[in-house]
């Protein structure tokens, strides 16, 4: 969480951002809130990115002002116009690119004063894993598959029955480049699987951590997946 305060002349206002991560090829949110103003026409929102000459986005007098928007963000940004009046300056970024990563500044001007806060935005790819039972040559294995990751993650298997066991010797993980030549499909196979046990496949890079759990019994197989973004710090 980053909380910024305005400086000089006018009073300062509090602006708060939250470090976040974007999934490349999907839409992302750069989060920013501020002390609201009663008049929309008095609010100016500017989003800037370190190292980029033009603006990322500008909203003033109740509408977008994109004449100075940098080319790399053309047609890809929007604020939540109906929520600006209540202090939401968050930016929606369409079709997140790897190059969108960096330090952004959310700069706010209202009738009460000015304020800004920085935001670290990471980009990569992350997806939910699915764990299934595979069967070939009369032996059972578990196959953990996740369609899109970047940068290359680590994959670790764990088991409820054999807590603390190292499964690296009885598992095999491969990374297959997807057609857009950036993200990769993750496939990890665990051998020597026993029934009446719960196994977890944990996939992690510096952006996200995902877990696929599978509980195998004779009568049913229970599966669940979780995805957690890392380093969501507020400023």
């Amino acid at each position: 969480l980053i909380i910024g305060f305005g400086i000089s002349g006018r009073h300062s206002i509090t602006v708060t951002t939250v470090a976040s991560a974007g999934n490349i090829g999907e839409d992302g949110i750069l989060s920013c809130t501020f002390e609201p103003d009663i008049k929309l026409s008095d609010i100016v929102i500017q989003w800037l990115k370190e190292g980029v000459l033009g603006l990322v986005h500008e909203f003033k007098e109740g509408k977008d002002e994109l004449s100075e928007q940098d080319e790399m963000f053309r047609g890809r940004t929007a604020v939540f116009a109906d929520q600006v009046i209540v202090g939401n300056a968050s930016l929606r970024l369409k079709n997140v690119q790897l190059t969108d990563a960096g330090t952004y500044k959310c700069y706010i001007i209202t009738s009460k004063g000015k304020g800004n806060a920085n935001l670290e935005y990471k980009t990569g790819a992350f997806s939910m894993p699915e764990v299934n039972v595979d069967y070939n040559a009369s032996s059972e294995t578990l196959r953990c598959e996740a369609p899109r990751w970047f940068p290359q993650p680590t994959v670790v298997w764990a088991s409820q029955v054999d807590q603390g066991a190292n499964f690296s010797e009885v598992s095999n993980t491969s990374f297959e480049l997807n057609s857009e030549n950036v993200t990769m499909k993750v496939v990890s196979v665990l051998y020597n699987v026993t029934i009446n046990n719960t196994y977890s496949c944990m996939i992690e890079n510096d952006i996200a951590k995902a877990t696929g759990d599978i509980k195998v019994t004779e009568s049913e197989i229970k599966r669940r997946s979780h995805l957690q973004l890392l380093n969501s710090k507020a400023s």
Epitope: E130, N132, V133, D134, Y135, N136, E140, E218, S219, E220, I221, K222, R223, R224
Partner: antibody
């Protein structure tokens, strides 16, 4: 005795939604996942999804993701399946089935017709 | 999705006959296969789970066998109450899929 009692038959217009209930008794509701399966007239069985009543974790059949919504009410030990944007092909008998699909409800007939 | 192919789709048999229904999976599912019985207007009943385990209360004339991709349900001596439709279902992979059903009719 394990029992799954489903709500009555429904007739719906295309584009509308239907919500089918499944009231359970005779076992600990939160200890078993609940499955939903449907059967179109003269057809086989088709799995819609499953929900863990303890925390409402859900696995959907991708075919129904976005249209089917599975929920539970732990206070009444009841599971629900809502299907939106109904079309004529959704005309079917809808079943709830406990845990490892060992006990099934009697089925709810949903007819979609203009 | 895993395709489950059941055969025959229907059969005629007499009381006392031995009846065999087969189910084939499009890929290996180990032993994660159930068999169900469905009668018109009645709740579906689980007969067999994990290929060959008899569900509680199911008569011993029902048995299941197989592994991998090919499975069989056998009724050793058909009884009047056994005339129904039978379904296989795999639970190895999501989404769980069913066979098309086999209707057992009186000859």
């Amino acid at each position: 005795e394990v029992q799954l009692v489903q709500s009555g038959a429904e007739v719906k217009k295309p584009g509308s939604s239907v919500k089918v209930s499944c009231k359970t008794s005779g076992y600990t509701f939160t200890s078993y996942w609940m499955h939903w399966v449907r059967q179109a007239p003269g057809q086989g069985l088709e799995w819609i999804g499953e929900i863990d009543p303890s925390d409402s974790y859900i696995n959907y059949n991708q075919k129904f993701k976005g249209r089917a919504t599975l929920t539970v009410d732990k206070s009444t030990s009841t599971a629900y399946m809502e299907l939106s944007s109904l079309r004529s092909e959704d005309t079917a008998v809808y079943y709830c089935a406990r845990g490892p699909r060992d006990y099934w409800g009697q089925g709810t007939t949903v007819t979609v017709s203009s | 999705d895993i395709q489950m192919t059941q055969s025959p789709s229907s059969l005629s048999a007499s009381v006392g006959d031995r009846v065999t229904i087969t189910c084939s999976a499009s890929q290996g599912i180990s032993n994660y296969l159930n068999w169900y019985q469905q009668k018109p207007g009645k709740a579906v009943k689980l007969l067999i789970y994990y290929t060959s385990r008899l569900h509680s209360g199911v008569p011993s004339r029902f048995s299941g066998s197989g592994s991998g991709t090919d499975f069989t349900l056998t009724i050793s001596s058909l009884q009047p109450e056994d005339f129904a439709t039978y379904y296989c279902q795999q639970y190895s992979k999501l989404p769980y899929t069913f066979g098309g059903g086999t209707k057992v009719e009186i000859k």
